[in-house]
Every structure is written in structure tokens, then in C-alpha cells.
């Protein structure tokens, strides 16, 4: 889970084990602050629940896409 | 294309433990969440519990929670559920069943474990 | 929890003719901003594990006669075989995967009249 140790700063400090269904995540968000120990995404899921996922795993990257086209709006 | 393939039927006396087992092909187990189904003669299907990947854990129904623990070898890609403290009402078709990564639904179950408990 | 309520418990329809199916939650299983229902049907025959017909409350899974179809969205769901065939004699199942721990409906048996 994403640690805020002085807000507005979110660190994660360990990653999910698992792959997460894509069809469940809401959205997501970088954490690419110097003051963090490690680059990372965390993922809203449909339930709210926030998950922190290592930006260099294939299946976060594709996650990522997926959002990303989801929520492109389309062209008229 | 995933498949599971369960262990065989299994015959145990009131009060014993029965392990049954799961061997994923075509995916790791690691790339999936593994989910146990029972079902009781003439009956419905029950969820028992599985991993939840959102809770980085596997989580267990209520009813359940006391006497089952659902483990996985990922050497072997071998998911098991151990049931304790049988007692006549545990007999049951057993199934594991899996959801993939563009899925949330369980779209690949396995044949199913017939567990009778009988003295 | 979400409770799934189906019915009937059991329907005896001529061959031919048309089924329907009802599963009620108890909560919305509908995530809005993307417009998905986080429900599934399952198709049970005799001896046989569950076989995924319909996800997403309406798309029919690949392989599956387009007789069978399935409608609703919140908390009302509907499984219609629109034509009964021999072969659709079975235990239906509604279950929702929106949030854990995951359920069933209580199961709707199909036999012919």
C-alpha cells in the first residue's frame, strides 16, 4: 500500500506480487518524486482500494496503456 | 490458453483433512489468481475463498476461515486447498478456478474433486 | 456481502420456446465510469464444471449460440434463451465479481416441458 509519510508526498515502498486484472483498475497515477526511494504507479482499483506496482513490469505498463486509451476522448 | 487439472477423488473419515491440488498449464500460477468453488450434492456453487491480488493475499469466506488455508507451490504452478475437521456436510465437488489478466471473471475452472466424508 | 437472488428456482419450458431468467443484488455491481456490470452467467450441466456463457452482464463468451443472451445493468440481471434446445438443460448461475468475497445466485434449474 502507498505510504503519504509527509503529505503531499506518496512513497511505495513495495510492489504488488501478482497481477492485478486490468478490468478492475480505475485509474492510476506516477510516483516519480526524488524523495521517494523508487519510481512506482499506483493503481485506484473499482473498489478504491490503492495498489503500488513496479513501473517496469510488462502487465503495469500494459495496465497503464489501457487506461490511457479508456480515457482518451474520441475524435469526432 | 489456461488449463487446470485437479487431483483425484478422495474418501475421508468425520474429523480428518483432505488436500487437494491444482496444476495450472499454459500461464504461471504467479500471472493468476487461483479461486476454490465447492459444491454440494444437488446443491449450489460456494465460494471457499482465493487470492485477492488487490489485498496482496488470499482471502477466505467467512464461513470457512477456520478450517481451510489455500496454499501455492509456484516451483510446480500447483495451487492447494486443505480443508480440516471434515464433517459429513464437507462432501462436495471441490473446483479451483482462475480469472487471467484481461479478466476478472472466472473463465477457466477445473474438472473438480469429488470429496466424500463418510464413517 | 452482495447477495444474488435468482428466479425462478426452476423452470420447465417446451422446446422451441423462450426462457428467462432473473438475478437480483442486493448492491450495484455497476462501475459507472467505464458503464460495466461486474456480473457473470454460468451454464452447469450434470457432472460437469461451470461453463461461462455471459460477462460483463451481456457479452456472450466466444463459442456460446447467440440464443443466449443477457441484459440489466445496477441490480437487475436477465438470462434469455430465446429459443430452448435439448442441449440447454442445465443449472444456471448468476455471480458478481465487482467486489470480494465473490458470490452465486442460488441457481436456476432449466428442464424441458
Known amino acids: 500500500q502507498p505510504d503519504a509519510i509527509n503529505a503531499p508526498v506518496t512513497c511505495c515502498y513495495n510492489f504488488t506480487n501478482r497481477k492485478i486484472s486490468v478490468q478492475r483498475l480505475a485509474s492510476y497515477r506516477r510516483i516519480t518524486s526524488s524523495k521517494c526511494p523508487k519510481e512506482a504507479v499506483i493503481f485506484k482499483t473499482i473498489v478504491a482500494k490503492e495498489i503500488c506496482a513496479d513501473p517496469k513490469q510488462k502487465w503495469v505498463q500494459d495496465s497503464m496503456d489501457h487506461l490511457d486509451k479508456q480515457t482518451q476522448t474520441p475524435k469526432t | 490458453q489456461v488449463q487446470l487439472v485437479q487431483s483425484g477423488a478422495e474418501v475421508k473419515k468425520p474429523g480428518a483433512s483432505v488436500k487437494v491440488s491444482c496444476k495450472v498449464s499454459?500461464?504461471?500460477?504467479?500471472?493468476?489468481?487461483m479461486h476454490w468453488v465447492r459444491q454440494a450434492p444437488g446443491k449450489g456453487l460456494e465460494w471457499m475463498g482465493g487470492?485477492?491480488?488487490?489485498?496482496?493475499?488470499?482471502i477466505y469466506a467467512q464461513k470457512f476461515q477456520d478450517r481451510v488455508t489455500m496454499t501455492e507451490d509456484t516451483s510446480t504452478d500447483t495451487a492447494y486447498m486443505e480443508l480440516s475437521s471434515l464433517r459429513s456436510e464437507d462432501t462436495a465437488v471441490y473446483y479451483c478456478?482462475?480469472?487471467?489478466?484481461?479478466?476478472?471473471?472466472?473463465?477457466?475452472w477445473g474438472q473438480g474433486t469429488l470429496v466424500t466424508v463418510s464413517s | 456481502d452482495i447477495v444474488l437472488t435468482q428466479s425462478p428456482d426452476s423452470l420447465a419450458v417446451c422446446l422451441g420456446e423462450r426462457a428467462t431468467i432473473n438475478c437480483k443484488s442486493s448492491?450495484?455491481?455497476?462501475?459507472?465510469?467505464?458503464?460495466?456490470?461486474?456480473l457473470v452467467w454460468y451454464q452447469q450441466r450434470p457432472g460437469q464444471p461451470p461453463k461461462l456463457l455471459i460477462y460483463?452482464?451481456?457479452t456472450r463468451e466466444s463459442g456460446v449460440p447467440d440464443r443466449f443472451s443477457g441484459s440489466g445493468s445496477g441490480t437487475d440481471f436477465t438470462l434469455t434463451i430465446s429459443s430452448l434446445q435439448a442441449e440447454d438443460v442445465a443449472v444456471y448461475y448468476c455471480?458478481?465479481?465487482?467486489?470480494?468475497?465473490?458470490?452465486f445466485g442460488q441457481g436456476t434449474k432449466v428442464e424441458i416441458k
Open positions: 478456478a482462475t480469472n487471467d489478466f484481461w479478466s476478472g471473471y472466472f473463465d477457466c
Open positions: 499454459g500461464h504461471t500460477l504467479t500471472e493468476l489468481s
Open positions: 487470492f485477492d491480488p488487490e489485498d496482496d493475499e488470499t
Open positions: 448492491q450495484s455491481v455497476l462501475y459507472s465510469p467505464n458503464n460495466k456490470n461486474f
Open positions: 460483463w452482464a451481456s
Open positions: 455471480q458478481q465479481y465487482y467486489s470480494s468475497p465473490w458470490t
